[in-house]
Interface confidence: medium
Amino acid sequence: LSTCKTIDMELVKRKRIEAIRGQILSKLRLASPPSQGEVPPGPLPEAVLALYNSTRDRVAGESADPEPEPEADYYAKEVTRVLMVDRNNAIYEKTKDISHSIYMFFNTSDIREAVPEPPLLSRAELRLQRLKSSVEQHVELYQKYSNNSWRYLGNRLLTPTDTPEWLSFDVTAVVRQWLNQGDGIQGFRFSAHCSCDSKDNKLHVEINGISPKRRGDLGTIHDMNRPFLLLMATPLERAQHLHSSRHRRALDTNYCFSSTEKNCCVRQLYIDFRKDLGWKWIHEPKGYHANFCLGPCPYIWSLDTQYSKVLALYNQHNPGASASPCCVPQALEPLPIVYYVGRKPKVEQLSNMIVRSCKCS
Amino acid sequence: LSTCKTIDMELVKRKRIEAIRGQILSKLRLASPPSQGEVPPGPLPEAVLALYNSTRDRVAGESADPEPEPEADYYAKEVTRVLMVDRNNAIYEKTKDISHSIYMFFNTSDIREAVPEPPLLSRAELRLQRLKSSVEQHVELYQKYSNNSWRYLGNRLLTPTDTPEWLSFDVTAVVRQWLNQGDGIQGFRFSAHCSCDSKDNKLHVEINGISPKRRGDLGTIHDMNRPFLLLMATPLERAQHLHSSRHRRALDTNYCFSSTEKNCCVRQLYIDFRKDLGWKWIHEPKGYHANFCLGPCPYIWSLDTQYSKVLALYNQHNPGASASPCCVPQALEPLPIVYYVGRKPKVEQLSNMIVRSCKCS
């Protein structure tokens, strides 16, 4: 790899290994490796191994950091609002005497006007304005599923409030699903949480522009405060570039380990505790794939080069518009270890030890 | 600010401003600023402003990126398991004929053995091993609150499975609360989701080592598979360092804008679209606090300097054990804008535009 001057890859690896030596001791608050004089002979106790495996399983099940943003997330999102179907629509007829829930229906053709293709949708929020209330209530949100069934989406504990407040629910997956189906009326149900042993199943929360009992004055409520969907989507014409232009690659192990990428990428580095650090005191694991980030992130002068080709480079080389972009870790994962303090085995988890992907920042 | 050579702060700002010029156009997929020839005179339409405000409200309500990790998260966590109180304990007596729920009780003195102080707890997971099942069921987890009441914690949709599988619930806040109370028996309830209009409230899920109906063979179930709490905590002796040693500061606007920090920090930069970029085409906002990251992140050679003072520096200057640590954005926020394309006003959201804090990475 070369930037202005040739990079000494071996020196970089050595510096990374030495940094890890300090990092592990520092994370354990140890001034030096613990003495191994009292460590009992033989394998680790079964209970300790089970605990180590439990910790490792947790790590496998959930990555410590959010996934790197997909390419489309770099680009601007057009924001639109879709108001719920008017309360005078016949579709609300059969819902008006239900005390445990209120209903909000949306016409998917209105949604499709704003978001013609399901993958263009970046985020959808259901926004409801809750009126002032003196009671605490646990509420749930459901999605209309088939003719007469509802699918649970989420819940919220609503505490008393002196002023109207907006509630927001992330319904991205639901709206994307609607867009994958045909045009029609789809809806949400906002319900009291009914516990198996609870008696009071009435919804005490009032939502602006809607209410369990149909009122004559609903038509007068200002449209702005009626429940609506806030949609964020990549405009169609911008999305067509995404397919045609060179993709921003995820600078992760899948791509970087199998390519000859000269620019910023994650580089392979396995650390063997014995061989690389001369340590015998970490009993599990024997080593780990630490990896590291390396490669240039060119600064792009945009003043005299305002044309598509140069602008497309921003996404890859300087998405954060830094004055001096730098190749740094993006997704990191923790590392569980087993070591002894005197005769006592310990299982500890070290955060942010494994570099999974890099980015220019 | 100086590193080896003096930094020309004005040049850095200029480069950041120019990078932002390219970044905004690039995010909007524009080769050049849009023509303003057809823009109607007068203020923005009310509906467009309402939409812009809705988007801005969303941004205010939830930061786009996770909060920077607290200092304690840098250090290793000791992992321990606390098994639930044995099913033969009399406390289970009054729960055995309830078909909608199963109960798991824990002795807080066992938990306190592992975590003597509430703030030391980093994470607590309730782990249950679900036996194979051919039914789908929506389940809920509750925390024992006062003598006869239960507080809702979370839910899960369990799909059919051919093999036993572990379920994990994050119960950190609950366990921390228990640690803040006296010693005693505390518990969880694992229940069927009872909808306001549902008839079948029976829990069909079976959990290893526990079951709605008490069985004679429960004692034989291997302890490893009985429900347990997986605890991750900072050991007491390590925590005492946290109070005594120099804290790792959050390199955010609160700290950096009011200090003379020479090392990596977020630096103030307001961009006025008209003055700084010569742009009249962005109608809202008029400008924004872009900010930027600047300052050295010294590499620490740990080979011949294994002593506490140097190790403490890792946390601040090179927590990721990089071969060449770099001052980069940590928390970023989006920016909603209003601009015209021809006669049509558009509200768009640009991701990762405002730098709230920095880190050495």
Epitope: I91, F105, R112, G182, D183, I185, Q240 | -
Partner: antibody
Framework: LQLVESGGGLVQPGGSLRLSCAAS????????MAWVRQAPGKGLEWVSA????????YYANSVKGRVTMSRDNAKNTLYLQMNSLKSEDTAVYYC??????????????WGKGTLVTVSS | QSVLTQLSSMSGSPGQTVTITCTGS?????????LSWYQQLPGTAPKLLIY???NRASGVPNRFSGSKTGSLASLTITGLQAEDEADYYC???????????FGGGTKLTVL
């Protein structure tokens, strides 16, 4: 605005056919599209629809699994690939522009149609 | 058998008013889904008359109007003319099928 179908003709049962529809006079890449057929002397039957970018397609139960609808926005062309044809697929096939972008909410412009005859 | 039911034929004299009906169910018309009406003159392709239940397509004379009550939709033609002799189809999205459906069609004869 113009929609011109082509590719119809005589085909044996079990055979395949690919219909095309050339679109002009509107922004094809922003429009949902549909195919509708009409058997001789019978009523209209909706066959399939596609969204503007082609990421979602919808089919009538009578053709599901035998028919694939696709589009090439660069060429402003819509396609209907028909396999395992049966005699009951004999009809005039119309290409139509969707009222909204799914093609499932009605059609506002129609082509003149192309005749497909399935017979041995 | 169509999901949307129409009378197979109707007739009327010039100048008269005729109403063509289309009966559906809660999974289509009654579900609040947009209904369209199409006219097909003999030997030609269908043409959109009405969309979204009661909106006239461009170029359609105001003699044509649409309405809906519950699951019943209607197309009304006032001041019937000879050139209105055609087949008329209703069409709507059906959520139980996740498809678009047409009525069987009504053949209107102008006497």
């Amino acid at each position: 605005l113009q929609l011109v179908e082509s590719g119809g003709g005589l085909v044996q049962p079990g055979g395949s056919l690919r219909l095309s529809c050339a679109a002009s006079g509107f922004t094809f890449s922003r429009s949902g599209m549909a195919w509708v057929r009409q058997a001789p002397g019978k009523g209209l039957e909706w066959v399939s629809a596609i969204t503007p970018g082609g990421t979602a397609t919808y089919y009538a139960n009578s053709v599901k699994g035998r028919v694939t609808m696709s589009r090439d926005n660069a060429k402003n062309t819509l396609y209907l690939q028909m396999n395992s044809l049966k005699s009951e697929d004999t009809a005039v096939y119309y290409c139509a522009k969707g009222l909204v972008s799914s093609g499932l909410n009605g059609m506002d412009y129609w082509g003149k149609g192309t005749l497909v005859t399935v017979s041995s | 058998q169509s999901v949307l039911t129409q009378l197979s034929s109707m007739s009327g004299s010039p100048g008269q008013t005729v109403t063509i009906t289309c009966t559906g169910s809660s999974s289509n018309i009654g579900g609040g889904y947009y209904l369209s009406w199409y006219q097909q003159l003999p030997g030609t392709a269908p043409k959109l008359l009405i969309y979204n239940t009661n909106n006239r397509a461009s170029g359609v004379p105001n003699r044509f109007s649409g309405s809906k009550t519950g699951s019943l939709a209607s197309l009304t033609i006032t001041g019937l003319q000879a050139e209105d002799e055609a087949d008329y189809y209703c069409g709507c999205y059906d959520d139980s099928l996740n498809t678009y459906v047409f009525g069987g069609g009504t053949k209107l004869t102008v006497l």
